[in-house]
């Protein structure tokens, strides 16, 4: 796969993953009421990172935000933090990768700079994906623990108004947001890895510049404004080249062996 394609695909995959991380973070269905083996209730409960909701059989849905920070479980706070860190890193990764894309020309940025930026964005995407996966997994683990705890004492005594009240404990299971988060985190991670792989292809390789020969007939030596000679060698790069008027930028028809001066 060519460097441009690998980089572009990595960017797109990361972008889709990043969008998924945002979606998962905002979704209300991180945990949903377990309906299996429970009396059929006309009320369905589900919870997100930011609010909990109740949907009645009548069709009315009521959501209440968690308007406290101190009263929330530490694990929930940790999951929130991980998801937000993942989003922030993803935003930075996207901004960096836009400038790093090989198909976008910005000023006189050479490939070594683009390679560094591609690597940076790749690492940011990898960390972003890992944050999302860890966040979702921590929440899932919390759910599993609570599920089995509430299963152990399915019918618990609960102090209500005027003594002991028999209550069927509401058990929660994995909501759609967890699956969205896992997939999104995985995609962001894969996209980041692809960006890092693309970075290796962008890094200038000394072997490409050992022999410099000229394709021009006669003394027609093309100079770049900076004074560097254009590498149009016959060696390993004997493919059709296009000579551009405005300096000696050459561009491969297939971008498998980019040269140092492919893009200004």
């Amino acid at each position: 796969m060519s460097v441009t394609a690998c980089q572009g695909l990595g960017f797109v995959v990361s972008l889709i993953g990043f969008a998924g991380i945002i979606a998962a973070t905002c979704m209300d269905q991180w945990s949903t009421q377990d309906l299996y083996n429970n009396p059929v209730t006309a009320v369905f409960n589900y919870q997100g990172l930011w609010r909990s909701c109740v949907r009645e059989s009548s069709g009315f849905t009521e959501c209440r935000g968690y308007f406290t920070l101190l009263g929330l479980p530490a694990m929930l706070q940790a999951v929130r933090a991980l998801m937000i860190v993942g989003i922030v890193l993803g935003v930075i990764g996207i901004l960096v990768s836009i400038f790093a894309l090989k198909c976008i020309r910005i000023g006189s940025m050479d490939d070594s700079a683009k390679a560094k930026m591609t690597l940076t964005s790749g690492i940011l995407f990898i960390i972003s994906g890992i944050c999302a996966i860890i966040g979702v997994s921590v929440f899932a683990n919390m759910l599993v623990t609570n599920f089995w705890m509430s299963t152990a004492n399915m019918y618990s005594g609960m102090g209500g108004m005027g003594g002991m009240v028999q209550t069927v404990q509401t058990r929660y299971t994995f909501g759609a947001a967890l699956f969205v988060g896992w997939v999104a985190g995985g995609l962001t991670l894969i996209g980041g890895v692809m960006m890092c792989i693309a970075c290796r292809g962008l890094t200038p390789d000394d072997s490409n510049f050992k022999a410099v020969s000229y394709h021009a007939s006669g003394q027609n030596v093309a100079y770049r404004p900076g004074g560097f000679k254009a590498s149009t060698g016959f060696g390993s790069n004997t493919r059709n080249k296009k000579i551009y008027d405005g300096g000696a930028r050459t561009e491969d028809d297939e971008q498998s062996h980019p040269t140092k001066y492919d893009y200004v």
Partner: antibody
């Protein structure tokens, strides 16, 4: 103003079937849930089931499965309940009611009296 | 099915008297998700359909006089009429609105002396 208009009284033979209607007006019928409630003369209230008119889903009281069939026609904003294999036990007033907050029934039809007699 | 038990089955009171009727369910009607009790109170006058008085155990329906008050949580609920009026002559039903199938209590018949 929200109204539920039910069909007129029915006199039916044992083992026959009747189809009761409940026409809704004054609100968007398709986004609502309509329940049916039975009340035998001088007795209490019994919930038969409910129709989710937006998706056609229905929930039945197990005691009425096989006895009542709930349907709805969105175009005419009308809910239907068919009662089959009628016996004297089915002689009652049948109400339709619209679900409200807390799964309560805020709006009721005037009731349809079904009399099963040989 | 959830069984709703109402007591007393009938009450005879004088006008402007305070009345209390009870409703007990076999399982808690409290939903942990929103901390609301899914219990409803209805008033049914002779020859009429039931009328919604209270939902969520204590929320008064709009248009219902404030002399009607619902209270209780879990399995034990109460409907209080602070000052009975002649027009309050009716049968009062409580309803489980939490578990399928929805079930009603047997009713409390309120009579005025």
């Amino acid at each position: 103003q929200i109204q539920l208009q039910q069909s007129g009284a029915e006199l039916a033979r044992p083992r026959a079937s009747v189809k009761l209607s409940c026409k809704a007006s004054g609100y968007t019928f398709t986004s609502d849930v309509i329940s049916w409630v039975k009340q035998r003369p001088g007795q209490g209230l019994e919930w038969i089931g409910e129709s989710y008119l937006r998706n056609g889903n229905t929930y039945y009281n197990e005691n009425f499965k096989g006895k009542a069939t709930l349907t709805a026609d969105k175009s005419s904003s009308t809910a239907y309940m068919e009662l089959r294999s009628l016996t004297s036990e089915d002689s009652a007033v049948y109400f339709c009611a619209r679900s409200y907050y807390g799964n309560s029934f805020a709006y009721w039809g005037q009731g349809t009296l079904v009399t099963v007699s040989a | 099915d959830i069984v709703m038990t109402q007591s007393p089955s009938s009450l005879t009171v004088t006008a402007r008297e305070k009345v209390t009727m009870n409703c007990k369910s076999t399982q808690s009607l409290l939903n942990s998700g929103n901390q609301k009790n899914y219990l409803t109170w209805y008033q049914q006058k002779p020859g009429q359909p039931p009328k919604l008085l209270i939902y969520w155990a204590s929320t008064r329906e709009s248009g219902v006089p404030d002399r009607f008050t619902g209270s209780g949580s879990g399995t034990d609920f109460t409907l209080t009429i602070s000052s009975v009026q002649a027009e309050d002559l009716a049968v009062y039903y409580c309803q489980n609105a939490y578990y399928y199938p929805f079930t009603f209590g047997g009713g409390t018949k309120l009579e005025i002396k």
